[in-house]
């Protein structure tokens, strides 16, 4: 229903704490360079204004849209042009163009320093002094680095953060309590970020229909006992929630997500038998829990998919009468039977089925034409299955770091023009798929591997879009989202690439590497590995292994030496010479 004051309505629905958190996230995602204090001031002003509207919905400006209110606040920031350049031009536009303009200026790779975690004692002190400000800093720092982070989910991670600090700051050994727990939250939040970015990409590039198809497949896998009408309702609501969040309408998004969680918990009987534990939790935990709830048990008596979609004499008639509904029922029926497939694979199968009907229903004898469609799915299913087997075997043999290196070599060969930092980041993220997915039961591996890889490759595409350098990457990123991963997998060595000349300074290291944390050491070594491949794109795995083993040995020796600097300056040039010889 329409409300006299949208801002009062959202404040009342969400409550002050969530309202302020969401407004802070919204501002931090739009203006990524502003400090926490600048944003906190704006948030307080907006909150005070919302309270006046709650008291009197007819008060001045209370009837304005949230975009207008928030946009006016952002545009009133001093030195906007100096700090943000052409983003300031957005302020010359009217709504809704102004908001669209802000969205287009969101930066997926802002030049901000990495979010460093303070040491335990300092963290606990500032948390105890002012928990609200501490959590505000967390929301601000994450949101500005991840401008599409799913806002209600970020509130959930902040709540997790809060609980961990409350617990660990009371312990004697704060460090050993905090580190593993906060690392766990960070890992989950980063995965959540790339997954949500993929959803927003789907929405931005291919529209609501594409996202809704994704949602139908995903929900059908999770809730195989729900009927098609129920799945369609959930998919429609979920599409609305994600559209709002991707569009910067964070208050509406969080409010509608809470409504959807409420609906699901009130209708468990027609959705799934697995929801009760989630529904017993408070709001943020409930919505998070529902988003990753385990799959319900599949009905035992499901007929073969062929009955309705191949053998039925009315296939073309049903398709003609309501294409989207018929394809939707196909996607629903196929997905509920295959929780072991990735959503990307299910969407590829639905696309193949649609293309088959488009072709066959135009023929004089359609059944003879589409009669083999299910058999034609086989190669589409085998390809990702082989990918999972090959990669998980390799991961089990090499471990995470070695597996990342194997991927780094592979991807540097596929797209050597891409910047080394981007290649290293992508390979490290892609390599984590082993730890994340290869340890799961067989039937959960494929959906985990492929949907995670798709999300990581979406980030590769977004970064590449900013500065396109590789035709290979452009080709794979230009197609549909579900075809990207197979496209990247199929890429081979880029034959058009002219190898980089060998620069000794690229492979020259100093004693400061010895004091770096293990992760930073790995990144240094992986940077060198990518540079080696750019120098010799056709180097064999054996050659690269020889060089990398030599390099690791050199670091180990020099970092243990009494006079590290001398060791690095004398042994370093020898290492460079040996590298050149090994790759000759």
């Amino acid at each position: 229903e329409a409300h006299k004051s949208e801002i009062a309505h959202r404040y009342n629905d969400l409550g002050e704490q969530h309202f302020k958190g969401l407004v802070l996230i919204a501002f931090s995602q739009y203006l990524q360079k502003c400090s926490y204090d600048e944003h906190a001031k704006l948030v307080q002003e907006v909150t005070d204004f919302a309270k006046t509207c709650v008291a009197d919905e007819s008060a001045a400006n209370c009837d304005k849209s949230l975009h207008t209110l928030f946009g006016d606040k952002l545009c009133a920031i001093p030195n906007l042009r100096e700090n943000y350049g052409e983003l300031a031009d957005c302020c010359t536009k009217q709504e809704p163009e102004r908001n669209e303009c802000f969205l287009q200026h969101k930066d997926d790779n802002p030049s901000l320093p990495p979010f460093e975690r303070p040491e335990a004692e300092a963290m606990c002190t500032s948390f105890k002094e002012n928990p609200t400000t501490f959590m505000g800093h967390y929301l601000h720092e994450v949101a500005r680095r991840h401008p599409y982070f799913y806002a209600p989910e970020l509130l959930y991670y902040a709540e997790q953060y809060n609980e961990i600090l409350t617990q660990c700051c009371a312990e004697a050994d704060k460090e050993s309590c905090l580190t593993p727990k906060l690392d766990g939250v960070k890992e989950k939040a980063l995965v959540s970020s790339v997954r949500q970015r993929m959803k927003c990409s789907s929405m931005q590039k291919f529209g609501e229909r594409a996202f809704k198809a994704w949602a139908v497949a995903r929900l059908s896998q999770t809730f195989p006992n729900a009927d098609f009408a129920e799945i369609t309702k959930l998919a429609t609501d979920l599409t609305k929630v994600n559209k709002e969040c991707c569009h910067g309408d964070l208050l509406e998004c969080a409010d509608d997500r809470a409504e959807l969680a409420k609906y699901m918990c009130e209708n468990q009987a027609t959705i799934s038998s697995k929801l009760q534990t989630c529904c017993d939790k408070p709001l943020l935990k409930k919505a998070h829990c529902l988003s990753e709830v385990e799959h319900d048990t599949m009905p035992a008596d499901l007929p073969a998919i062929a009955a309705d979609f191949v053998e039925d004499q009315e296939v073309c008639k049903n398709y003609a009468e309501a294409k989207d509904v018929f394809l939707g029922t196909f996607l629903y029926e196929y997905s509920r039977r295959h929780p072991d497939y990735s959503v990307s694979l299910l969407l590829r199968l639905a696309k193949k089925y649609e293309a088959t009907l488009e072709k066959c229903c135009a023929e004089a004898n359609p059944p003879a034409c589409y009669g083999t469609v299910l058999a034609e799915f086989q190669p589409l299913v085998e390809e990702p299955k082989n990918l999972v087997k090959t990669n998980c075997d390799l991961y089990e043999k090499l471990g995470e770091y070695g597996f990342q290196n194997a991927i780094l070599v592979r991807y540097t060969q596929k797209a050597p023009q891409v910047s080394t930092p981007t290649l290293v980041e992508a390979a490290r993220n892609l390599g984590r798929v082993g730890t994340k997915c290869c340890t799961l039961p067989e039937d959960q591996r494929l959906p985990c591997v492929e949907d995670y890889l798709s999300a990581i490759l979406n980030r590769v595409c977004l970064l590449h879009e900013k500065t396109p350098v590789s035709e290979h990457v452009t080709k794979c990123c230009s197609g549909s989202l579900v075809e990207r991963r197979p496209c990247f997998s199929a890429l081979t060595v880029d034959e058009t690439y002219v190898p980089k000349e060998f620069k000794a300074e690229t492979f020259t290291f100093h004693s400061d590497i010895c004091t770096l944390p293990e992760k930073e050491k790995q990144i240094k070594k992986q940077t060198a590995l990518a540079e080696l491949v750019k120098h010799k794109p056709k180097a064999t795995a054996e050659q690269l292994k020889t060089v990398m083993d030599d390099f690791a040995q050199f670091l180990d020796t020099c970092c243990k030496a009494a006079d590290k600097d001398t060791c690095f300056s004398t042994e370093g040039p020898n290492l460079v010479t040996r590298c050149k010889d090994a790759l000759a």
Partner: nanobody, 115 residues
Framework: KVQLVESGGGLVQPGNSLRLSCAAS????????MGWVRQAPGKGLEWVSS????????LYAPSVKGRFTISRDNSKNTLYLQMNSLRPEDTAVYYC????????SSQGTLVTVSS
């Protein structure tokens, strides 16, 4: 909404001709193969003929081959069945349908062949 409306049926003497038409709406006509099925009094549905979306391919039941001709005009969203050398056993209600489908989703048009 998909609609198929047949016309052109009637009473004819054996050996004569009739031309049936089917006006289609509610879908992209040229993207679908179309056909004709018939139902004689007291009998089940029988497939007669079908044609591809472009009109380039046609198929006929052995009982009508050489006598009946199926055609279409995609610019008018219309399907036709030219029936020559009609026989008493051709008496039936004729239904326009999607190729590969043996169903009646329309009213049909009655063709009676009798002397």
């Amino acid at each position: 909404k998909v609609q198929l409306v047949e016309s052109g049926g009637g009473l004819v003497q054996p050996g004569n001709s009739l031309r049936l038409s089917c006006a289609a709406s509610g879908f992209t006509f040229s993207s679908f193969g179309m056909g004709w099925v018939r139902q004689a009094p007291g009998k089940g549905l029988e497939w007669v003929s079908s044609i591809s979306g472009s009109g380039s391919d046609t198929l006929y039941a052995p009982s009508v081959k050489g006598r009946f001709t199926i055609s279409r005009d995609n610019s008018k969203n219309t399907l036709y069945l030219q029936m020559n050398s009609l026989r008493p056993e051709d008496t039936a209600v004729y239904y326009c349908t999607f190729a590969g489908s043996l169903s009646r989703s329309s009213q049909g048009t009655l063709v009676t062949v009798s002397s």
